[in-house]
């Protein structure tokens, strides 16, 4: 009911009403990432499943080429979880000359790209030092918040190291957004 | 206003309108867990407070026997946090014969049960290796995402080890869902 | 369309309809914290950016003096992430007299203040032991859930140690709420 003043003419309408069921929404789930080249000093973007299993896009929210495309301006709740896993970290090694090591780390960034704006905007970042000794490790980073987006904006999820992402299960690593 | 075409007859209606205040919603909070038998290789489900303190259910969203019962089909945002606490983990012990240890871990799963479907569906999983040395430890796992659910679906929260769940405060461990 | 019975008179109306775009909403982002006195045994509250960059308040949701002021009763989704960072923790030191150390920890609490009620209510808590050896550390705590709030309620974010909060980027530490 987007854009309709949905009332008898004698009533004052402050904003168009619309049914909740027709709002743009998406929940994307992890797939195996194909190793690809990415620009130096730029975190690689994940690609996603958008229609199988738990994944879906609806009401003009489309997924293409690692991006969720925002079809309508408004306030969106955006969320992602990335589960990382890796081998024993070396961050507990003896420090030389009294200097603390730069720790190993894992980072997730939800990024907005606006074609009319030269630089991507980082909306959300979760970053964690990893200092695990004695065994392989695994852990999730979860992010979620509300942002005002414009029609045509594109959203992606970037990670510090694509080779550490746990791509094995759709419930471990995911990305979604919905219009409020 | 569910199911009503809520407009003068000359207007095109794409989907029924409904007031936000009558949508199914619940926020459940932790209670002390009674040790119970559970199937081997199946994580035990938590039970919850549904009406005291911060907890509530409303608009036909009911809680019974560890399950949230979905009263109406639609897209729901589902979330949970479980705070775990435990003693020092042994995962950093010297490895024998060059074999990496299987690390201690904590896991939360939000699971959907559909009576017409034989197997539960894991919607969300947060899993983390625990390798803490020298002291007791505590940490939360948070999950949240949007899913398309059907009337009659049931939701529960399963954990890897019920004895590690911090049940002391309603703000530390909780579970909720609301229709978008 | 708050407060209007928005239908031809022959239809039963269960609750007033309202346009989604006029609901109270806020997303606040981190700023450098001014060291301030706070009561003993009470975690200090963070203050926030409310209009620059990604931050905004709208539809009568106001920010003042570390508080988000709730302008309308209803069910709100409330969320926050705080990224902490610090130096090597000492929690893995040898324990004296066989007693396990009280570990270093980081805690975030989202608190509700109701003027008519003497004590603040802790809505959400994320708390984590920190036991990092050999390097500096950093990590986020994320919280989010739905609560029934009353007009005039005030929300704030408290942390265990304001000096450990990473205030460097608006995507790392944030606080928000929106009426459902």
């Amino acid at each position: 009911l987007k854009g309709q003043e949905f009332a008898p003419s004698h009533q004052q309408v402050y904003a168009p009403l619309r049914a909740d069921g027709d709002k743009p929404r998406a929940h994307l789930t992890v797939v195996r990432q194909t190793p690809t080249q990415h620009f130096k000093n730029q975190f690689p973007a994940l690609h996603w499943e958008h229609e199988l299993g738990l994944a879906f896009t609806k009401n003009r929210m489309n997924y293409t080429n690692k991006f969720l495309l925002i079809p309508e301006s408004g306030d969106y709740f955006i969320y992602s979880q990335v589960t990382f896993r890796g081998m024993t970290s070396e961050c507990s090694e003896i420090r030389q000359a009294g200097r603390p090591n730069k720790p190993d780390s894992i980072t997730v960034v939800i990024t907005k790209v606006t074609d009319s704006y030269p630089e991507p905007t980082q909306l959300l970042m979760g970053t964690k030092s990893v200092c695990e000794v004695g065994s392989n490790w695994f852990q999730p980073i979860y992010l979620g918040a509300m942002f005002s987006l414009q029609e045509g904006d594109k959203l992606m999820v970037n990670v510090s190291d694509i080779s550490l992402v746990d791509y094995t299960k759709e419930d471990k690593t995911f990305f979604g957004a919905f219009l409020l | 206003l569910k199911g009503q075409e809520f407009a003068p007859s000359h207007q095109q209606v794409y989907a029924p309108l409904r007031a936000d205040g009558d949508k199914p919603r619940a926020h459940l909070t932790v209670v002390r867990q009674t040790p119970t038998q559970h199937f081997k290789n199946q994580f035990p489900a938590l039970h919850w407070e549904h009406e005291l303190g911060l907890a509530f259910t409303k608009n036909r969203m009911n809680y019974t026997n560890k399950f949230l019962l979905i009263p109406e089909s639609g897209d729901y945002f589902i979330y949970s946090q479980v705070t775990f606490r435990g003693m020092t983990s042994e995962c950093s012990e010297i490895r024998q014969a060059g074999r990496p240890n299987k690390p201690d871990s904590i896991t939360v799963v939000i699971t959907k049960v559909t009576d017409s479907y034989p197997e539960p569906t894991q919607l969300l999983m947060g899993t983390k290796s625990v390798c803490e040395v020298g002291s007791n430890w505590f940490q939360p796992i948070y999950l949240g995402a949007m899913f398309s659910l059907q009337e009659g679906d049931k939701l529960m929260v399963n954990v890897s080890d019920i004895s590690l769940v911090d049940y002391t405060k309603e703000d530390k461990t909780f579970f909720g869902a609301f229709l978008l | 369309l708050k407060g209007q019975e928005f239908a031809p008179s022959h239809q039963q109306v269960y609750a007033p309809l309202r346009a989604d775009g006029d609901k109270p909403r806020a997303h606040l982002t981190v700023v450098r914290q001014t060291p301030t006195q706070h009561f003993k045994n009470q975690f200090p509250a963070l203050h926030w950016e409310h209009e620059l960059g990604l931050a905004f308040t709208k539809n009568r949701m106001n920010y003042t003096n570390k508080f988000l002021l709730i302008p309308e009763s209803g069910d709100y989704f409330i969320y926050s992430q705080v990224t902490f960072r610090g130096m090597t923790s000492e929690c893995s030191e040898i324990r004296q007299a066989g007693r396990p150390n009280k570990p270093d920890s980081i805690t975030v609490v989202i608190t509700k203040v109701t003027d008519s009620y003497p004590e603040p209510t802790q809505l959400l808590m994320g708390t984590k032991s920190v036991c990092e050896v050999g390097s500096n550390w950093f990590q986020p705590i994320y919280l989010g859930a739905m609560f029934s709030l009353q007009e005039g309620d005030k929300l704030m974010v408290n942390v265990s140690d304001i000096s450990l909060v990473d205030y460097t980027k608006e995507d790392k530490t944030f606080f928000g709420a929106f009426l459902l």
């Epitope: 190793p35 896993r85 081998m87 080779s163 094995t168 | - | -």
Partner: antibody, heavy 117, light 107 residues
Framework: ELQLQESGPGLVKPSETLSLTCAVS????????WAWIRQPPGKGLEWIGE???????SYNPSLKSRVTVSIDTSKNQFSLKLSSVTAADTAVYFC???????????WGQGTLVTVSS | DIQLTQSPGTLSLSPGERATLSCRAS??????LAWYQQKPGQAPRLLIY???KRATGIPDRFSGSGSGTDFTLTISRLEPEDFAVYYC?????????FGQGTKVEIK
């Protein structure tokens, strides 16, 4: 402890199909991709392809037209089929666990397959 | 495909000496490079991933460095069990490819 064990015929005739199986024990089968890698005598390593528990596969483009990797989760094993073999396919064939992603931390001991009439 | 060229082909050293092995990629692979050790009649063993991260259980005399196109595996002090063939492997682009190997032999 994780163990991988290759099995299959050691001799295959030219133009026929090479078939190998890798049995996995000691670890959850569902949490990883599982790969086949080969090594011709006295030469380097070549990645053939991989599969996960859902049957999702990826293959080396140089072999893709001849390779099929399949999986049997009920038996915790995965298999390799390489069709239309020639002498150039003579190699030690290894199965391996893909971890961390795209590297291989656990390997079978390898099985030599000779293509000869 | 990305080609990996290892040098030297053979390295003759004595126990206790330092070994420096090189791997050059035909195009940038960022830090997506691993090193393996293989002894005769055995499967390869993962030593290093992410160009510089030691795999679980690998002694700290093994270290990796480099980024982009040029990478080095260093064995700080050769032990008798370190004499073997070493392979690099890139995973920046599909298909995954290996170098031709460097043999470290006893002088």
């Amino acid at each position: 402890e994780l163990q991988l064990q290759e099995s299959g015929p050691g001799l295959v005739k030219p133009s026929e199909t090479l078939s190998l199986t890798c049995a996995v024990s000691g670890l959850s089968f569902t949490d990883f991709y599982w790969a086949w890698i080969r090594q011709p005598p006295g030469k380097g390593l070549e990645w053939i392809g991989e599969i996960n528990h859902k049957g999702n596969t990826s293959y080396n483009p140089s072999l893709k037209s001849r390779v099929t990797v399949s999986i049997d989760t009920s038996k915790n094993q995965f298999s390799l089929k390489l069709s239309s073999v020639t002498a150039a396919d003579t190699a030690v064939y290894f199965c391996a666990r893909d971890f961390p992603n795209y590297t291989f931390d656990f390997w079978g001991q390898g099985t030599l397959v000779t293509v000869s009439s | 495909d990305i080609q990996l060229t290892q040098s030297p082909g053979t390295l003759s050293l004595s126990p206790g000496e330092r070994a420096t092995l090189s791997c050059r990629a035909s195009q940038s692979v960022s830090n997506h490079l691993a090193w393996y050790q293989q002894k005769p009649g055995q499967a390869p063993r993962l030593l290093i991933y992410g160009a510089s991260k030691r795999a679980t259980g690998i002694p700290d005399r093994f270290s990796g460095s480099g980024s982009g196109t040029d990478f080095t595996l260093t064995i700080s002090r050769l032990e008798p069990e370190d004499f073997a063939v070493y392979y690099c492997q890139q995973y920046a682009d599909a298909p995954l490819t290996f170098g031709q190997g460097t043999k470290v032999e006893i002088k």
